[in-house]
């Protein structure tokens, strides 16, 4: 899983934003519910899809300079 160091509880975001569970910041709510890929052929493994949100906690995030 993407568990990192202990992170604070999600901070409230303004209505136009969503709390990103990886970067631990409010971000613009992007594409809602990205469509799942179709099963891949036998020649290649199927792409991974969404991790469970509770497992999507990343390490510390830093903004770009």
């Amino acid at each position: 899983s993407l568990r990192g160091r202990d992170a604070p509880a999600p901070t409230p975001c303004v209505p136009a934003e969503c709390f990103d569970l990886l970067v631990r910041h409010c971000v613009a709510c992007g594409l809602l519910r990205t469509p799942r890929p179709k099963p891949a052929g036998a020649s290649s493994p199927a792409p991974r899809t969404a991790l469970q949100p509770q497992e999507s906690v990343g390490a510390g995030a830093g903004e770009a300079a």
């Epitope: 993407l2 999600p10 975001c13 969503c18 709390f19 990103d20 569970l21 990886l22 971000v27 613009a28 709510c29 992007g30 594409l31 809602l32 519910r33 990205t34 469509p35 799942r36 890929p37 792409p47 991974r48 899809t49 969404a50 991790l51 949100p53 999507s56 903004e63 770009a64």
Partner: nanobody, 121 residues
């Protein structure tokens, strides 16, 4: 069909640079935030960087801040990761991942197949 195809990985010496590319198709790339996430051999997944749909918001993990640069070209449906001053600990499979949002939260959505970066002298 959503497709993410990473390229640009390879074997490189410490201190050198690589540029990873992710070609996206099958969804509206220009409205989707994107992540780079990596997995080192025998280790768990580690988030590397995030870029918003318009490139106005960018975040980096502490481990790569100042060395890696994420960017995107929405006209080409392409995501990039410029990796400079590479270290042995950057050795990993690098995945291009869409951001999926719902119920006020965002999290990883669809993953590419990954491209392998090996930093070794």
């Amino acid at each position: 069909e959503v497709q993410l195809v990473e390229s640009g990985g390879g074997v490189v010496q410490p201190g050198r640079s690589l540029r990873l590319t992710c070609a996206a198709s099958g969804f509206t790339f220009s409205t989707s935030g994107m992540y780079w996430i990596r997995q080192a051999p025998g280790k768990g997944l580690e988030w590397v960087s995030y870029i918003s749909s318009s490139s106005s918001t960018i975040y980096y993990a502490d481990s790569v801040k100042g060395r890696f640069t994420i960017s995107r070209d929405n006209s080409k449906n392409t995501l990039y990761l410029q990796m400079n001053s590479l270290r042995a600990e950057d050795t990993a499979v690098y995945y291009c991942v869409t951001q999926s949002c719902g119920a006020g939260k965002c999290y990883p959505g669809v993953w590419g197949q990954g491209t392998t970066v090996t930093v070794s002298s």
